[in-house]
């Protein structure tokens, strides 16, 4: 029987700059029971603060309501180990809510063939950004990624679409169906997971007009 | 206890290209950005990039955006930092850097640096 | 870029001495300022981040103050481990940028 081994906070996000949540990795038990606190405190402040929600963000985990979650100041945190033989400590974690924000998938997307007369035909894709990001204040970037392939391929190929809700998409293979998803991630920040798919069917005579 | 080792000085002639390392442990890997720093002898710090290991997306200094190249190998714990064409003035120590948190750049634990030298 | 000039570019002190050294950024940076320690032959330590907020185990006689586009690191009263050369760091816009370093060095 042993101290417990020491734990570290490998992870937190935020769906929208109001709450977040941080998860932590177990260190060793020490072969008997052990309980764990995460304790944190403001940049500039001394006063520590305990977790005020163990619940909501599953096992090990810690989270952060809007009453506890303060955009442009850093929260200093650990955890603490505990079983009858002793105490771990993970390493002090730095965490600025404005950089762990993973926002929900891009909405409404929505797919569309153009065949102009005088040009080349294209893929037209268009989509939303997700409800819960304010764009309007300026605290948000967000940059969008396009993935699409014909049903049956086994790779993706992918298009950067920096700020801009819509894409043009020029060189597909005529007869196919394709299926295209979006994601969008803050300037700092992580990538949503990808859309639900939306499939289109690209029409045989898909092709440059002369 | 965490750690960033980086591979050993290399000597390259001008126009190749070097591939430095840098392998971290002591830490979940995934979770902060790695930044890349160069020293030229006796002069200041100079930031090359950054890479954020959990998907790979990296941002550049424009002066070396065409030439730096990083990359990340999650199941090593490894950062790359690669830069072709080489020239006399690319001589520099070359640091690997974590990113102090979940947050702004700044740098909590560095490398011990990788020495290159372009030389003809 | 924003260029941030480091004066003096060396400082020759005492042990015991209260040393000074700013920082000027070329544009507003608010508070996200880092300031780092190098040793000869050493990789750089991180002493202080967001202008005035001390690194985990960093001693209390460093301190900075400042906001905007002018910083001062202060070690209010120099040990012989301090003599070493300082560089500040702006982190905020791309790319991020130092300074060119202040030497500091026994009288």
């Known amino acids: 029987q042993l101290p417990p081994g020491k734990p570290e906070i490998f992870k937190c996000r935020s769906p929208n700059k109001e709450t977040f949540t941080c998860w932590w990795r177990p260190g060793t038990d020490g072969g008997l029971p052990t309980n764990y606190s995460l304790t944190y405190h403001r940049e500039g402040e001394t006063l520590m603060h305990e977790c005020p929600d163990y619940i909501t963000g599953g096992p090990n985990s810690c989270h952060f309501g809007k009453q506890y979650t303060s955009m442009w100041r850093t929260y200093i945190m650990m955890v603490n180990a505990t079983n009858q033989m002793g105490s771990s400590f993970s390493d002090e974690l730095y965490v600025d809510v404005t950089y762990i924000v993973q926002p929900d998938p891009p909405l409404e997307l929505a797919v569309e063939v153009k065949q102009p007369e005088d040009r080349k035909p294209y893929l037209w894709i268009k989509w939303s950004p997700p409800t819960l990001i304010d764009l309007k204040t300026g605290w948000f970037t967000l940059l969008y990624e396009i993935r699409l392939k014909p049903e049956k391929a086994a790779e993706w190929e992918i298009h950067f679409a920096g700020q801009q809700t819509e894409f043009k998409i020029l060189s597909l293979h005529p007869g196919q169906k394709y299926l295209v998803q979006v994601r969008c991630k803050p300037d700092h920040g992580y990538w949503s997971a990808w859309s639900p798919a939306t499939f289109i069917q690209i029409p045989s005579d898909f092709t440059m007009n002369d | 206890e965490v750690q960033l080792v980086q591979s050993g000085a290399e000597v390259k002639k001008p126009g190749s290209s070097v591939k430095v390392s840098c392998k971290a442990s002591g830490y979940t890997f995934t979770t902060y950005w790695m930044h890349w720093v160069r020293q030229a002898p006796g002069q200041g710090l100079e930031w090359i990039g950054e890479i954020d290991p959990s998907d790979s997306y990296s941002n550049y200094n424009q002066k070396f955006k065409d030439r730096a190249t990083l990359t990340v190998d999650k199941s090593t714990s490894t950062a790359y930092m690669e830069l072709s064409s080489l020239r006399s003035e690319d001589t520099a120590v070359y640091y690997c850097a974590r990113n102090g948190g979940l947050g702004p750049a700044w740098f909590s634990y560095w490398g011990q640096g990788t020495l290159v030298t372009v030389s003809s | 870029d924003i260029q941030m000039t480091q004066s003096p570019s060396s400082v020759s002190a005492s042990v015991g001495d209260r040393v000074t050294i700013t920082c000027k950024a070329s544009?507003?940076?608010?508070?996200?300022v880092a300031w780092y320690q190098q040793k000869p032959g050493k990789s750089p330590k991180l002493l202080i981040y967001s202008a005035s907020n001390r690194y985990t185990g960093v001693p209390s006689r460093f301190s900075d103050s400042g906001s905007g586009t002018d910083f001062t690191l202060t070690i209010s009263s120099l040990q012989p481990e301090d003599f070493a050369t300082y560089f500040c760091q702006q982190y905020s816009s791309y790319p991020w940028t130092f300074g060119g370093g202040t030497k500091v060095e026994i009288k």
């Open positions: 544009q507003y940076v608010g508070t996200a």
